[in-house]
Interface confidence: medium
């Protein structure tokens, strides 16, 4: 199915957990924290052993000659982030000794500005798309990605780093948003909400989905994830909604079988490698493009969304896995790790279709298309 | 803490029901085992349930012979022994085994005694 | 099934001596191995994780190291209480060692 509202299509739980770790589900769970009504959480951390926060765990990507590795960005500053007034967040956190500033949570103190100013920018992500008001460019041409669908060796390290739960992809994954934008993808992570609330980052007129992927990318510009922070263009994010639909999807329960296994926060198992791509809608050319930021501390700006139009279809039981499975820290169950929207302030979100045209039936009055700004670069 | 209980002198091919009685800590959050150990020998893990209890494993010697349960609003976690053998035999503990960062790691309980015999 | 093999299965030694026991698994288990002391009549008690990792409250003669398929579990100064047997534990399978007996030289 597509966007609510938008036209056309849209497809995440199950499973029980991986046979080889029947030990693997033990970690402190307990009532979730009550959330604040201040200002909206924020996304994962950038990568490390460590998970040192920041929007998900950015892998260090370095020049050819030296081997990947894995980036603690332990410079950023990391905070607790506030909760979001309609969809409250659970208090989940990482905490890091010796340093107040070093952690930060989904629904919580101090507001997350406090902490990483950054987070306080004009042009913060996630924020709600409304198809009508996009600006249909059609110098956005379909995205290309290359080398997404890995053998089941090497193994990728599947991480719940108290924020999310992570996939670090290994070296080879090229992604293009058109000539000249290449990128090489690092990670990707999951938001979702809890039984009966949807938790995805971005929304559609206001509407929420059950969950939300994002496939994380560095510049082929940079050599490193901290060189890109706050540039315009330095990091890429592809971001799909997850939806409820009638059949397992079987690319996603690769991933959510092995969720018990990684039920305590800080835990990390092997997966077998996987069709990344298939973990994405099947359309690549339509989707809605914007400038915004890390959706966690320390929300840099600069970061190229690319939200998809077509969802990707998960069982109930599949979204149940998802957001019933993971522990955070502090006794408290991983759910609804989500920022709330962020103010556009000016900002225009493109189109690669023409999705004003016919796409939202609940538009009473005729809407003042915004004209597409980019050349398509 | 974890205390087991129902061991005890059994004939083969009969059954028991082993227990185990959780506090001090929030058993509802953790998978749990038993292992057991035949007497003058070693440890052998036997069965696992994930802390929801909606994911059991089993060791090849005891599959389809022992069910692992639990009752999280109990606190307590079982274990129905059926067609018992004399190799069955050994102390059975109930454990809490994987370690796990920041918290407490492993913890057993004191064991209870299955007798297989005629 | 991944099977773990420890050795040696006994060994003699002396307060003060080190002490070595190694464990091998049938396959690569990255980092998945726990080691534990157990003494007659008594639970086993946990003193290392993820091969390296210290149990909170364990004395630091004690240490693992190793990754994939081949680990060690080293006592530096045995003392008195030492005196017990080992167990290596994987925890992707998850199987025990045969186990090690250390007995009074």
């Known amino acids: 199915q597509r966007l609510p509202r938008m036209q056309e299509d849209s497809p995440l739980g199950g499973g029980s957990s991986g046979e080889d770790d029947p030990l693997g589900e033990e970690d402190l769970p307990s009532e979730e924290d009550s959330p604040r009504e201040e200002d909206p959480p924020g996304e994962e951390d950038l990568p490390g052993e460590e998970d040192l926060p920041g929007e998900e765990d950015l892998p260090e990507v370095k020049p050819k000659s030296e081997e990947e590795g894995s980036l603690k960005l332990e410079d950023l500053p990391t905070v607790e982030a506030p909760g979001d007034p309609q969809e409250p967040q659970n208090n989940a956190h990482r905490d890091k000794e010796g340093d107040d500033q070093s952690h930060w949570r989904y629904g919580g103190d101090p507001p997350w500005p406090r902490v990483s100013p950054a987070c306080a920018g004009r042009f913060q992500s996630p924020v709600d798309i409304r198809p009508q008001l996009a600006a249909f460019c059609p110098a956005l041409r379909p995205l290309e990605l290359l080398g997404f669908q890995l053998p089941p060796l090497p193994e990728l390290r599947l991480r719940n780093n108290g924020h999310s739960v992570q996939l670090t992809l290994p070296p080879g994954l090229e992604m293009a948003l058109g000539p000249g934008r290449e990128y090489r993808a690092l990670q990707l992570h999951l938001h979702w909400g809890a039984a009966g609330r949807p938790g995805s980052e971005h929304t559609v007129e206001g509407h929420r989905f059950p969950a939300e992927i994002h496939v994380v990318h560095l510049s082929t510009a940079f050599a490193r994830v901290d060189e890109a922070l706050g540039r315009p263009g330095g990091l890429a994010v592809l971001a799909a909604f997850l939806e409820e639909g009638p059949e397992e999807n079987s690319a996603y329960e690769q991933l959510l079988s092995r969720l018990e296994e990684i039920a305590e926060e800080g835990s990390e198992t092997q997966v077998p490698g996987l069709d990344i791509s298939a973990l994405l809608p099947s359309d690549f050319s339509r989707y809605f493009q914007y400038e915004g930021s890390l959706t966690t501390p320390p929300c840099a700006q600069g970061v190229i969304w690319t939200v998809f139009n077509q969802t990707v279809m998960l069982s109930a039981k599949q979204l149940h896995t998802l957001s019933d499975t993971l522990w955070g820290p502090g006794d408290s169950r991983l759910q609804l790790n989500f920022r709330a929207t962020q103010p556009l302030n000016g900002r225009v979100i493109e189109a690669s279709f023409p999705a004003g045209v016919d796409s939202s039936p609940r538009a009473a009055e005729p809407v003042q298309l915004n004209s597409c700004l980019a050349a398509g670069d | 803490e974890l205390v087991e209980s129902g061991g005890g002198l059994v004939q083969p091919g009969g059954s028991l029901r082993l227990s185990c009685a959780a506090s001090?800590?929030?058993?509802?959050?953790?998978?749990i085992s038993w292992v057991r150990q035949a007497p003058g020998k070693g440890l052998e893990w036997v069965s696992s349930?994930?802390?929801?209890?909606?994911?059991?494993y089993y060791a090849d010697s005891v599959k389809g012979r022992f069910t692992i349960s639990r009752d999280n609003s109990k606190n307590t976690l079982y274990l129905q022994m059926n067609s018992l053998r004399a190799e069955d035999t050994a102390v059975y503990y109930c454990?809490?085994?994987?370690?796990?960062?920041?918290?407490?790691?492993?913890?057993w309980g004191q064991g209870t005694l299955v007798t297989v015999s005629s | 099934d991944i099977q773990m093999t420890q050795s040696p299965s006994s060994l003699s030694a002396s307060v003060g001596d080190r002490v070595t026991i190694t464990c091998r698994a049938s396959?690569?288990?990255?980092?998945?191995l726990a080691w534990y002391q157990q003494k007659p009549g008594k639970a086993p008690k946990l003193l290392i994780y993820?091969?390296?990792s210290l149990q909170s409250g364990v004395p630091s003669r004690f240490s693992g190291s190793g990754s994939g398929t081949d680990f060690t579990l080293t006592i530096s100064s045995l003392q008195p209480e030492d005196f017990a047997t080992y167990y290596c534990?994987?925890?992707?399978?998850?199987?025990f060692g045969q186990g090690t007996k250390v007995e009074i030289k």
């Open positions: 454990a809490r085994m994987k370690p796990m960062r920041g918290y407490s790691g492993a913890v």
């Open positions: 001090g800590f929030t058993f509802s959050s953790y998978g």
């Open positions: 349930i994930s802390y929801s209890g909606s994911n059991t």
């Open positions: 396959q690569d288990i990255s980092n998945r």
């Open positions: 993820d091969a390296n």
């Open positions: 534990f994987q925890y992707s399978g998850p199987t």
